[in-house]
């Protein structure tokens, strides 16, 4: 999902050295930055979240806020500190003139400042309910009394918690942080105010139409009667949850965020902190028929982001818009005509649509999974959600062409049994942001903190790329892809796996410059090959070279073009075994695939040879896909021959551990 190069507007205000000395300049070499929502109508100028550096204490936050007020007052400006953050992020929320931004950015401890902006409920039409008969289907979904060990926090509108469908299941907290409703003639009708939240609470844990019928919920009001909230209100809500968790630690927590606003660095940062405190966050991808990476919290990598599909597993269309898509979406779930509790009466039901409803489904599934296995980490839960999803059922033609390869073709489903998946080696594919077209542009894909990067590949629609490599960054391996001159940009594709007690390293062989090609193998005792990458400095690898096929009996070896450096990902983990599987096609073909068989998991996907007519390689579920340029442009010579190379692994250790438990 979205990393630090998100598509938001960043204004770095230049610091004037001749400032009148009222503000202490930040430490040498650092400049605080200003961010605001890229979507102008959603901006809320006049209210700002001042985010302080990570290690700032509450007392320092309060002192910095007071200093800002004092300095503003000296200049004749009134300011109001609305909230001092601590527990999740250090900082404060301030109401002030935009004229003071330059001053505020120079305060000590300031990391960045973000202008407040709006967030919105993601159901359509969330307040134009079509009441359906309360009894709506005979063959009711009746899972076990699932989710009973889990608490689900809902950040939404107010809710009618005594509705028969959810009575006793939802505790309405006293948290409320909502903006005034728009319009002078707005009539605050209770049932409309409660509509969105009541429906979602019903989808998560309703007795009749709920996914996790045993889950208990807590609601926080961050959306007003028009389904509108603010980034700052949502932040304060997330902080409230963190403080509640610290005061009274309970079992697993799921936080449902059925809302979306423009890309927000601060909202994503707060989600990251909460996720790293062991909380599972599930959010709506957004209903804008757009790239989910342009929205928050959908773009936060630590959040499980959910798009919406209908009963036919097609992406949901909502008026002229529809579900968001792209690499920031983790999976899809039902989100069209979803029946749930209606706040129009205490026994009414209604159908609503949107990515909010889809996210509520996944929050319910997550609650069921966590209730069955309370020790699951966020990474383990996400991998299981992906693993148990229905694969390749969505018609990708609905998505823009450039987004199809990036969008996961996964529809959430409950596991056939909530126990017993422990033996599986789970892997997922993580796409980077697009590098951009400049000659030296690179793209980086990262795995979650408790996942292992087992392989790295790259993809470019133009075919102009210089391959990819795994490199260490902040003590973790990342996957970096390199653009080439004249290229329109590249993607890095990481294969991220759950491999307990793994010790992985990268072995590199420089370009061989010999006719045999470049080779590298895993030479350490007990290390197995999980992935191969190749990277080259030349603009164009010669296409006249024949494919270099792997010598038999050397499974722990990566081979590649003689002008490329080759990188082998070598891992040692208890019981880990891997094998190489190849599928070569002598005639040119736009796509070559090779899949791992049942019981094996795809960890590595690469192409032979790495010549320029190969657009790249990437993993889709358990299949390695190698894409080449349009056949019509390559001709049908041997140049067009491509081999897809899959590395398939399994863990005997995980299998044994699982058998011992059963």
């Amino acid at each position: 999902q979205e990393d630090e190069d998100g598509d938001y507007e960043e204004l770095v205000l230049a610091l004037r050295s001749e400032e009148d000395g009222l503000a202490e300049a930040p430490e040498h070499g650092t400049t605080a930055t200003f961010h605001r929502c890229a979507k102008d109508p959603w901006r809320l100028p006049g209210t700002y979240v001042v985010v302080l550096k990570e290690e700032t204490h509450l007392s320092q936050s309060e002192r910095t806020a007071r200093r800002l007020q004092a300095q503003a007052a000296r200049r004749g400006y009134l300011t109001k500190i609305l909230h001092v953050f601590h527990g999740l992020l250090p900082g404060f929320l301030v109401k002030m003139s935009g004229d003071l931004l330059e001053l505020a950015l120079k305060l000590p401890h300031v990391d960045y400042i973000e202008e407040d902006s709006s967030v919105f409920a993601q159901s359509i039409p969330w307040n134009l309910e079509r009441i359906t008969p309360p009894r709506y289907r005979a063959d009711e979904y009746q899972p076990p009394d699932g989710g009973s060990l889990v608490e689900v926090y809902l950040l939404d509108t107010s809710i009618q918690s005594d509705h028969r469908e959810i009575e006793g299941r939802v505790m309405v907290t006293d948290f409320e942080n909502v903006p005034e409703e728009d319009g002078t003639r707005f009539h605050r009708q209770a049932s409309k105010c409660d509509s969105h939240g009541t429906h979602l609470a019903g989808v998560v844990s309703g007795r009749d139409a709920g996914v996790a019928k045993g889950a208990s919920m807590r609601s926080l009001r961050v959306l007003n009667c028009q389904g509108k909230g603010t980034v700052s209100g949502t932040l304060i809500g997330l902080e409230f949850i963190r403080k509640s968790q610290l005061v009274q630690p309970v079992g697993p927590l799921v936080v449902l965020l059925p809302l979306a606003g423009g890309y927000s660095r601060v909202l994503n940062a707060a989600c990251q902190r909460l996720a790293r405190a062991g909380v599972v966050l599930v959010t709506a991808a957004g209903n804008f028929r757009d790239d989910a990476c342009l929205y928050s919290p959908a773009s936060a990598p630590e959040v499980i982001t959910v798009g919406a599909t209908n009963a036919q597993d097609q992406p949901v269309t909502l008026g002229t818009l529809g579900t968001n898509f792209g690499r920031c979406v983790d999976l899809f779930a039902p989100g069209e005509d979803i029946i749930g509790a209606s706040s129009d009466c205490s026994t009414c039901f209604v159908s609503q649509s949107g990515t909010s409803q889809a996210a509520a489904h996944v929050a319910g599934i997550a609650a069921m999974m966590l209730s069955a296995e309370p020790e699951l980490t966020l990474a383990e839960l996400r991998q299981r959600l992906i693993h148990f999803s229905a694969k390749d059922v969505i018609n990708e033609a609905w998505f823009p062409e450039d987004q199809r390869v990036l969008t996961p073709n996964l529809v959430a489903a409950l596991p056939p049994s909530t126990h017993g998946a422990g033996w599986q080696l789970f892997c997922r594919t993580v796409w980077s942001a697009h590098s951009g077209p400049t000659r030296m542009a690179t793209a980086v894909a990262r795995c979650a903190p408790d996942e292992e990067l087992l392989s790295c590949s790259s993809f470019s629609r133009s075919g102009k790329r210089r391959g990819e490599r795994m490199e260490a960054q902040g003590g973790k391996l990342v996957c970096r892809a390199h653009n080439a001159f004249g290229g329109e940009g590249v993607y890095a594709i990481a294969r991220c796996c759950l491999l307990p007690q793994a010790n992985c390293s990268v072995h590199t062989a420089p370009p061989a410059e010999a006719s045999m090609g470049t080779r590298v193998h895993c030479h350490q005792q007990g290390h197995v090959l999980t992935g191969c990458s190749s990277h080259w400095e030349v603009e164009d690898l010669g296409t006249h070279k024949p494919p270099v096929l792997r010598p038999r009996g050397q499974p722990n070896q990566c081979v590649g073009h003689r002008e490329a450096s080759i990188h082998a990902s070598c891992c040692h983990a208890p019981g880990l075994e891997c094998k190489v599987k190849e599928h070569g096609i002598p005639a040119p073909q736009e796509q070559v695939t090779v899949a791992c068989e049942e019981g094996w998991t795809l960890t590595g996907c690469s192409a032979l040879p790495g010549t320029s007519h190969v657009l790249g390689a990437y993993a889709v579920d358990n299949t390695c896909v190698v894409r080449s340029r349009d056949v019509s442009t390559t001709g049908s010579t041997s140049e067009g021959a491509v081999t897809a190379v899959a590395i398939c692994c399994r863990s005997r250790h995980l299998a044994q551990a699982s058998q011992e438990l059963q």
Partner: antibody
């Protein structure tokens, strides 16, 4: 602890009105409404209706035919059931219970309608 | 309205006996069924909710089963304090309705 405490017994003349109260404590009021159920001597249980502590919303049994009104006062955590134009067949024990699922019951209030 | 029919309307049993009471709904109510115990002069007490889930504090000798239209309350080994009247209640639809009751008496 979670409990519903009802007002004391009432003796009323036909045509009069009665108002029974039910004070809730020990749980989150807004998470449940209050159901009212009556039981005539030697008879079974009959649901009269439901009222919300959250927003005052009501749901009445048809049989009440506009004779009954259910209200709540969240400030005192109390629910009320008023029955007008009393008849002798309204003689019963009136119970309040928590929610539609009726997980907790009040001790009951005996209402006798007699001339 | 959904009709709830309980059977038998009364039964005589001895301490230690296994007792079964049935409740039939006039239409499908999924699992929206509760069972109550009422002793003379007392308010009903919830025993089983959602057709089969035991309310906290209720002895394990009480169990409920069924889904759709047919439901059963079973007392595996009748105890002296179990002699009372038992009611089923559906809350699948409003008005919520009760069975006419089953009186369990000492043989």
């Amino acid at each position: 602890q979670v409990q519903l405490v009802q007002s004391g017994a009432e003796v009323k003349k036909p045509g009069a009105s009665v108002k029974v109260s039910c004070k809730a404590s020990g749980y989150s009021l807004t998470s449940y409404g209050i159901s009212w159920v009556r039981q005539a001597p030697g008879q079974g249980l009959e649901w009269m209706g439901w009222v919300s502590f959250y927003n005052g919303q009501t749901n009445y049994a048809q049989k009440l035919q506009g004779r009954g009104t259910m209200t709540t006062d969240p400030s005192t955590s109390t629910a009320y059931m008023e029955l007008r134009s009393l008849r002798s067949d309204d003689t019963a024990v009136y119970y309040c219970a928590r929610g539609y699922g009726m997980s907790i019951w009040g001790q009951g209030t005996t209402v006798t309608v007699s001339s | 309205d959904i009709q709830m029919t309980q059977s038998p309307s009364s039964l005589s049993a001895s301490v230690g006996d296994r007792v079964t009471i049935t409740c039939r709904a006039s239409q499908n109510i999924n699992s929206w069924l509760n069972w109550y115990q009422q002793k003379p002069g007392k308010a009903p007490k919830l025993l089983i909710y959602g057709a089969s889930s035991r309310q906290s504090g209720v002895p394990s000798r009480f169990s409920g089963s069924g889904s759709g239209t047919d439901f059963t309350l079973t007392i595996s080994s009748l105890q002296p304090e179990d002699f009372a009247t038992y009611y089923c209640q559906q809350w699948f639809d409003v008005p919520t309705t009760f069975g006419q009751g089953t009186k369990v008496e000492i043989k």
